[in-house]
């Protein structure tokens, strides 16, 4: 019962986590204009992985997609890649874990197969979560570096009468969504791996031990105790699922690359 609960909870937590990773990847607010120096700005800038937006005080919002692929910073491309890998692994993990759930009966699937699938999906969730956390952290690091660079620029070359306002960017909501979602996916993966241990059948076969109490002599059959510890060859453990052999056609939908208001 505890195993089923752990597995089910792991699945739900991972599902929420992956939904969060997808949401974070699609969100436009990865970086938002720092309002420390001007808290009542009439023009507010924010940027995502796929486009940058400007929200005016008038209420109008204009978003522009990053049309170039080669012209984008390598770090941004790396973050995109990490997030997509995280989503793809998470999606495959979810698909695998659905079939691995103890509460779902599919044909005559044995517990050992479900255990393998649970472990596979758990590992996938862990890697997915790590990818998301890594992606968000790389972006955050990039923001911090750029923030201090632009801060340094703000206080140099101010000798002239005309001031040029340098727009600085700080952490956007998507970063926090990404961190939390990645953490949840990671936790869900760990729970799946824990559940896998409970699902794996401990096939300890005790052969009959006969005791004969005939008069004075007690006959004992030696060699009767044979424990299948799992280290030796186990003919009963048939491998019916190969985690690495599964391929999925992932259709990833991105925000529109067209400008719209």
């Amino acid at each position: 019962m505890a195993v089923t609960a752990c597995q089910g909870l792991g699945f739900v937590v991972s599902l929420i986590g992956i939904a969060g990773i997808i949401a974070a990847t699609c969100m436009d607010q990865w970086s938002t204009q720092d309002l420390y120096n001007n808290p009542v700005t009439a023009v507010f800038n924010y940027q995502g992985l796929w486009r940058s937006c400007v929200r005016e005080s008038s209420g109008f919002t204009e978003c522009r997609g990053y049309f170039t692929l080669l012209g984008l910073p390598a770090m941004l491309q790396a973050v995109r890649a990490l997030m997509i890998v995280g989503i793809v692994l998470g999606a495959i993990g979810l698909l695998v874990s659905i079939f691995a759930l103890k509460c779902i009966r599919i044909g005559s699937m044995e517990d050992s197969a479900k255990a393998n699938m649970t472990l596979t999906s758990g590992i996938m969730f862990i890697v997915s979560g790590l990818c998301a956390i890594a992606g968000v952290s790389v972006f955050a690091n990039m923001l911090v570096t750029n923030f201090w660079m632009s801060t340094a620029n703000m206080y140099t070359g101010m000798g002239g009468m005309v001031q040029t306002v340098q727009t600085r960017y700080t952490f956007g909501a998507a970063l926090f969504v990404g961190w939390v979602a990645g953490g949840l996916t990671l936790i869900g993966g760990v729970m799946m791996c824990i559940a896998c241990r409970g699902l794996a059948p401990e096939e300890t076969n005790y052969k009959a031990v006969s005791y004969h109490a005939s008069g004075h002599s007690v006959a004992y059959k030696p060699g009767g105790f044979k424990a299948s510890t799992g280290f030796g060859s186990n003919t009963k453990n048939k491998k019916i699922y190969d985690g690495g052999a599964r391929t999925e056609d992932e259709v990833q939908s991105y925000p529109s690359k067209h400008d719209y208001v």
Epitope: A42, V43, N45, S58, G59, V162
Partner: antibody
């Protein structure tokens, strides 16, 4: 055709209060951020206040902050400007304006004259 | 606050001639996010409210004749009337629409020579 019609102007003594109204028609009032702009006789235009479309944000210059309050009633398509502690320098024609792209004041009313004098 | 300075204060131009009005801001009005300049031009005729001519420094408002054009970037901007018409006699104002408080230039009075 978009119409903005200001009302509520008049003569008021220094330290007194006045409430201006701006009735909007022929455009989706609730979608627009709105502003009040004033113009003293023979002087340049001066921005007085702005309110966002959803009423969540209001902005004022230091010259009127704490004395003037901008508000709106989207159900009635009406913009308001509550003016307290009026001074002689607040004497001007007050216009209401609807903000469009580029934060530009796209639609303007005909204005209402506010005279602060003893 | 951003200070807007217009020049000249008044301008007399012959009908059919080009009229040029300048506007200078104390800070850049260029927004890095969309590479647009948040400068607006208005026309005000005597006894009337102002009328929007140009926003984003160079985008003409719908219904505005194409003889009106705006140019410039950063801190220096220009409003040009390519061929002055009698109905163009008015006071022209530039406005900072980039940051609060919104500020207007002192105005340029355009007359016919």
């Amino acid at each position: 055709e978009v119409q903005l019609l200001e009302s509520g102007g008049g003569l008021v003594q220094p330290g007194g209060s006045l409430r201006l109204s701006c009735a909007a028609s022929e455009f989706t009032f609730s979608n627009y951020a709105m502003s009040w702009v004033r113009q003293a006789p023979g002087k340049r235009l001066e921005w007085v206040a702005t309110i966002s479309s959803g009423r969540s944000s209001t902005y004022y210059p230091d010259s009127v902050k704490g004395r003037f309050t901008i508000s709106r009633d989207n159900a009635k398509n009406t913009l308001y400007l509550q003016m307290n502690s009026l001074r002689a320098e607040d004497t001007a024609v007050y216009y209401c304006a609807g903000l469009g792209r580029g934060n530009a004041m796209e639609y303007w009313g005909q204005g209402t004259l506010v005279t602060v004098s003893s | 606050d951003i200070v807007m300075t217009q020049s000249p204060d008044s301008l007399a131009v012959s009908l059919g001639e080009r009229a040029t009005i300048n506007c200078k801001s104390s800070q850049s009005l260029l927004n890095s996010g969309n590479q647009k300049n948040y400068l607006t031009w208005y026309q005000q005729k005597p006894g009337q409210p102002p009328k929007l001519l140009i926003y984003w420094a160079s985008t003409r408002e719908s219904g505005v004749p194409d003889r009106f054009s705006g140019s410039g970037s950063g801190t220096d901007f220009t409003l040009t009337i390519s061929s002055l018409q009698a109905e163009d006699v008015a006071v022209y104002y530039c406005q900072n629409a980039y940051s609060y408080p919104f500020t207007f230039g002192g105005g340029t009075k355009l007359e016919i020579k």
